[in-house]
C-alpha cells in the first residue's frame, strides 16, 4: 500500500497528489521542445539544452540544479572526408558507393548538423577485400561459420545484420575471427514490421534509413581514457593505444537499399539454414566473395572518423529529503541523441521533466520527500554511458554509502503494446503493488489496472497471474549503479508485442527518422502511454523516497537465487562425466541459497513486527535492505571485467543488452568442451561456484539479526 507520510505537510500530499499532477499534454509539449534540433553529445546544441533543463528544473522548484562536466573521448565523422563503402572492379575503380547520408524526413530538409550515419569509435582505415556474410555476428554465428562450414573470416570484410545482440559484441566477434572490416546493416526482417508503411507514412524503416551507434566493448569502464576514475580537470589519461574497449578494425553502418547491392552479388557457400536469411531478395550466400561475373570485384571501406576528447555536461538536480537527507533515490536518463531523439532519449527525458515538475509543485506547497531525490540528465550515453559513469565514479563513495535506488529513464516507449520492466528482485513487489494502483491505458482494458493488462499481455513464464519482469542487462545508464556499485535499480517503458526481436530495438532506432512526428503520429498520439510510464517511473521514485520502510522484499531475491542456481546447475550437468572427473559440486551454492532463503524469511517477519516509531531500529532495518544489493558486489569484479562486480547479474559476455545470472559460473562453463586445458577450465568453474556461494552466504548474513 502506498504511504501517506506527513513530513510537515498536509495529508493531501501523498502519492495520489503526485500522480494526479502528471499530465500527458505537458509530456507532449516537452517532447516537442526537446526534438526540434539534434542534440549530439559534445555539441553546442546539447550544452544549450543542458542549460535550459537546469534553468527549468530550478523554476520547477528543486533545491539545487548543477551542471557536472567531464572531458571524455567521443567520436565524430570527418566533415570534409565522408565515410562510405564501395564496390571496386579489378582496376580499383569504384563502381558503386553507399549513400553518404539519410534522405532527411519531411520538414527537416534544412536542419543543419545532422550527423551522417557512422559507427562511433571506428578507427580510420580503407580496407578492401572479399565479403563474408556472418548473419547477426553472434558468437554462435561465428561458431557455425568457422566450425561447421569451415569458412575463414581472416582478412575478409564481414557484413552483419543488426539485431539480437549489442553491435559492440558483433564487432568484437568479428575482430576475434580475424576480419579486417565490418559492415553493419538493418535487414527488413528485423526492422520492418509486416503491414506497416515506412516513414513518413508509418513507423517502419525506409531503405535509406541507417542505425547509428557506438561499437565499444567498455565492460562498464566509462570514458575509455580514464577507467575507474572521473574524467575531470586533473585526470591522467591513457594513450589511445591503451584506451579501454576501442575497436581495432573499421566499421560502418548502412541501410537495406545499400545492403541489397552488396548482398545480391554474394557467392560462395549457401546460407546454412533459413535462420540466416533475411527479407531482402538476395540469396544470403555467405561467401567469401562475389559470384561468377562479379568475382573480380571487391568491397572497399573508406572510414575517416576521429576520436576527440570533448566536454560533456550532466544536469544534476536535488530535492532534499526531510527526514533522511543522506539517503539518495536517483531518477536518471540521458539527454544526448544521435539526431532528433524522438524516442531515444527524449521520450524519456520529457517524462523525467514532467516528474520533476510534479515533485516541484508538491515541494512549493510545503511538502518534502522523506529521502533525498536526485534527478539526472545524463550526457554521452550514446557514446558508452559516459556521463552517468563519470558522475558515479566521481561520487562513488557517497553513492555506495547513501544510494538507496536508481530508476532509469531512457526511452519511454519502444512500442505501444504493454509495459516492460527490468529490475532487481528487490523491486518486484514495489512494481506489482504500484501497477495494481495505476489505470491501464490499453484499449480493451478500460477501468482495469495496469497490472491486469500487463499480466494478460506479458505473463510471467514461471508464476501464473503475474507479469514478466526481466533481468537487468546493460546498454543504459543504470549500468554503473547496478553492475558496479550494487545500488538497487529498475527501468520501465512501454514495449511492442515482438518478443523474438527483444534486443533489435524499434525500426527507426538511432536513425534520422526518429522524430517528434514519429511519436505523435504513430506511437502515442494521446501521449497516454508516456503518461503511464511517467506514473510508473515517478511512482517508484515517490515510494522509494517516501515510504517509512523501504519497499524492498528480500524474499523475492531468495526465489530467483534458487531459480538461477537450478539453471546454472542444469547447464553444468550437460557435462556429467567431467563434473565427476573434476569433482565439481554445487552443494555449497545450494546450501548458501537455502540459508539466504531462511534468513530472508526471518528478516521479513521481523520487518513486519519491529517498532517503526524507533528511528534507530527503523534506520537499521532500512540499512539492511539498502545494503543487501551492495552485498552482492565482489570488490575484485568478474574475470577480465573489473567494473562488472555484481555476482548475481552481469551483462552477457555475448550480448551487452542481455542480463546473465551467475555470470562468473556461466562464462566459465561457456563452450567448455572446446577448451584446450579441461582441467584448468573446470578448475575455474569450481572457483566461480566458490565465489558465488560465498557471496550469497555473505549477503544472507547481512540480513541476520545484528547481534
Amino acid at each position: 500500500k502506498s504511504s501517506n507520510e506527513a513530513t510537515n505537510i498536509t495529508p493531501k500530499h501523498n502519492m495520489k497528489a503526485f500522480l494526479d499532477e502528471l499530465k500527458a499534454e505537458n509530456i507532449k509539449k516537452f517532447l516537442y521542445n526537446f526534438t526540434q534540433i539534434p542534440h549530439l553529445a559534445g555539441t553546442e546544441q546539447n550544452f544549450q539544452l543542458a542549460k535550459q533543463i537546469q534553468s527549468q528544473w530550478k523554476e520547477f522548484g528543486l533545491d539545487s540544479v548543477e551542471l557536472a562536466h567531464y572531458d571524455v573521448l567521443l567520436s565524430y565523422p570527418n566533415k570534409t572526408h565522408p565515410n562510405y563503402i564501395s564496390i571496386i572492379n579489378e582496376d580499383g575503380n569504384e563502381i558503386f558507393n553507399t549513400s553518404l547520408f539519410e534522405p532527411p524526413p519531411p520538414g527537416y530538409e534544412n536542419v543543419s548538423d545532422i550527423v551522417p550515419p557512422f559507427s562511433a569509435f571506428s578507427p580510420q582505415g580503407m580496407p578492401e577485400g572479399d565479403l563474408v556474410y556472418v548473419n547477426y555476428a553472434r558468437t554462435e554465428d561465428f561458431f557455425k561459420l568457422e566450425r561447421d562450414m569451415k569458412i575463414n573470416c581472416s582478412g575478409k570484410i564481414v557484413i552483419a545484420r543488426y539485431g539480437k545482440v549489442f553491435r559492440g559484441n558483433k564487432v568484437k566477434n568479428a575482430q576475434l575471427a580475424g576480419a579486417k572490416g565490418v559492415i553493419l546493416y538493418s535487414d527488413p526482417a528485423d526492422y520492418f514490421a509486416p503491414g506497416v508503411k515506412s516513414y513518413p507514412d508509418g513507423w517502419n524503416l525506409p531503405g535509406g534509413g541507417v542505425q547509428r551507434g557506438n561499437i565499444l566493448n567498455l565492460n562498464g569502464a566509462g570514458d575509455p581514457l580514464t577507467p575507474g576514475y572521473p574524467a575531470n580537470e586533473y585526470a591522467y589519461r591513457r594513450g589511445i593505444a591503451e584506451a579501454v574497449g576501442l575497436p581495432s578494425i573499421p566499421v560502418h553502418p548502412i541501410g537495406y537499399y545499400d545492403a541489397q547491392k552488396l548482398l545480391e552479388k554474394m557467392g560462395g557457400s549457401a546460407p546454412p539454414d533459413s535462420s540466416w536469411r533475411g527479407s531482402l531478395k538476395v540469396p544470403y550466400n555467405v561467401g567469401p566473395g562475389f559470384t561468377g561475373n562479379f568475382s573480380t570485384q571487391k568491397v572497399k571501406m573508406h572510414i575517416h572518423s576521429t576520436n576527440e576528447v570533448t566536454r560533456i555536461y550532466n544536469v544534476i538536480g536535488t530535492l532534499r529529503g526531510a527526514v533522511e537527507p543522506d539517503r539518495y533515490v536517483i531518477l536518471g536518463g540521458h539527454r544526448d541523441s544521435w539526431v532528433f531523439g524522438g524516442i531515444d532519449p527524449q521520450s524519456g527525458a520529457a517524462v523525467v521533466h514532467e516528474i520533476v515538475r510534479s515533485f516541484g509543485t508538491l515541494k512549493k506547497e510545503g511538502w518534502r520527500p522523506r529521502r533525498t531525490i536526485l534527478f539526472a540528465s545524463w550526457d554521452a550515453e550514446e557514446f558508452g554511458l559516459l556521463g552517468s559513469t563519470e558522475w558515479a565514479e566521481e561520487n562513488s563513495r557517497l553513492l555506495q554509502e547513501r544510494g538507496v535506488a536508481y530508476i532509469n529513464a531512457d526511452s519511454s516507449i519502444e512500442g505501444n503494446y504493454t509495459l516492460r520492466v527490468d529490475c532487481t528482485p528487490l523491486m518486484y513487489s514495489l512494481v506489482h503493488n504500484l501497477t495494481k494502483e495505476l489505470k491501464s491505458p490499453d484499449e480493451g482494458f478500460e477501468g482495469k489496472s495496469l497490472y491486469e493488462s500487463w499480466t494478460k499481455k506479458s505473463p510471467s513464464p514461471e508464476f501464473s497471474g503475474m507479469p514478466r519482469i526481466s533481468k537487468l542487462g546493460s546498454g543504459n545508464d543504470f549500468e554503473v549503479f547496478f553492475q558496479r556499485l550494487g545500488i538497487a535499480s529498475g527501468r520501465a517503458r512501454y514495449t511492442k508485442n515482438w518478443e523474438t526481436n527483444k534486443f533489435s530495438g524499434y525500426p527507426l532506432y538511432h536513425s534520422v527518422y526518429e522524430t517528434y512526428e514519429l511519436v505523435e503520429k504513430f506511437y502515442d498520439p494521446m501521449f497516454k502511454y508516456h503518461l503511464t510510464v511517467a506514473q510508473v517511473r515517478g511512482g517508484m521514485v515517490f515510494e522509494l523516497a517516501n515510504s517509512i520502510v523501504l519497499p524492498f522484499d528480500c524474499r523475492d531475491y531468495a526465489v530467483v537465487l534458487r531459480k538461477y542456481a537450478d539453471k546454472i546447475y542444469s547447464i553444468s550437468m550437460k557435462h556429467p562425466q567431467e563434473m565427476k572427473t573434476y569433482s565439481v559440486s554445487f552443494d555449497s551454492l545450494f546450501s548458501a541459497v537455502k540459508n539466504f532463503t531462511e534468513i530472508a524469511s526471518k528478516f521479513s517477519e521481523r520487518l513486519q513486527d519491529f517498532d517503526k516509531s524507533n528511528p534507530i531500529v527503523l534506520r537499521m532495518m532500512n540499512d539492511q535492505l539498502m545494503f543487501l544489493e551492495r552485498a552482492f558486489i565482489d570488490p575484485l569484479g568478474l574475470p577480465d571485467r573489473p567494473f562488472y562486480r555484481h555476482v548475481i547479474y552481469a551483462p552477457s559476455s555475448h550480448n551487452k543488452y542481455a542480463g546473465e545470472s551467475f555470470p562468473g559460473i556461466y562464462d566459465a562453463l561457456f563452450d567448455i568442451e572446446s577448451k584446450v586445458d579441461p582441467s584448468k577450465a573446470w578448475g575455474e568453474v569450481k572457483r566461480q561456484i566458490y565465489v558465488a556461494a560465498f557471496t550469497v552466504q555473505a549477503a544472507a548474513e547481512t540480513l541476520s539479526e545484528v547481534a
Partner: antibody, heavy 120, light 112 residues
Framework: QVQLVQSGAEVKKPGASVKLSCKAS????????INWVRQTPEQGLEWMGG????????NYNENFKGRVTMTRDTSNSTAYMELSRLRSDDTAVYYC?????????????WGQGTTVTVSS | DVVMTQSPLSLPVTLGEPASISCRSS???????????LHWYQQKPGQSPRLLIY???NRFSGVPDRFSGSGSGTDFTLKISRVEAEDVGVYFC?????????FGQGTKLEIK
Amino acid sequence: QVQLVQSGAEVKKPGASVKLSCKASGYTFTYFDINWVRQTPEQGLEWMGGISPGDGNTNYNENFKGRVTMTRDTSNSTAYMELSRLRSDDTAVYYCARDGNFPYYAMDSWGQGTTVTVSS
Amino acid sequence: DVVMTQSPLSLPVTLGEPASISCRSSQSLVYSNGNTYLHWYQQKPGQSPRLLIYKVSNRFSGVPDRFSGSGSGTDFTLKISRVEAEDVGVYFCSQSTHVPYTFGQGTKLEIK
C-alpha cells in the same frame, strides 16, 4: 512523387538502332533498378532486362542479348535502352519501370511508354 | 523461362458482381528467403500498367480494398469483390522470383 518520363515516339527502318530514354524524378535514382518492358499485341508484356543505376550492372533477357544495351547517366537520373538490328516485330510500346526494391520487388512505377514503329 | 498462364483471357462481369482471375506458373515462385514474388498489374485502356498487388496478397498503396490476391507455390488468384466501372482493363500476373521476369498473357475485364 515518383515519376518516369520517357522520350517521344520513334519510327525506324529495319536494321537500324533506336535509343530510348527514361528520366527519373521524385526519388534517389541510384537506389532502384530500372527495367525495360515492351508490349505487343502478339507477345503481350515482355521483360527485356534491367539496369542498376548505382553500379551500372545490367541483366538482360536472353531473347534480346546481343541486341539490347542498357546504360544510365546518374548525373541527370536518366536510364537509356538501345535496341539494335531492328526488325518489324520489334514494333511495340516500350516502357521503363522502376523495380520497387523491398518490400515490393515489383515494378511499382511505370513510364508513359514510347511507341517504336519499325517499317521499311 | 517461367511460363505464366492466365485464365480466363476475357472476363465479362456485371457491375457490383465479384470477379476472379487465375494465374498458374510453370514452376514454384517461392524464393529462397521464403517470399513469393508474384504480382498483379492493371492496365486501363490507353494507359501504362500499374502495380495492383505485390507478393501474392499485398495491396499496393492507393489500391482499393475490393482487390485481393491469394495463392501459393504455382497457383494464384486475383479477386475483385464488387466490380466497378473504373476496373475495366487488362490484368496481368507477373513473377520476379526467377530471371527473366515473365508476365501472363493478360485477362481483359469488361462490363456485361
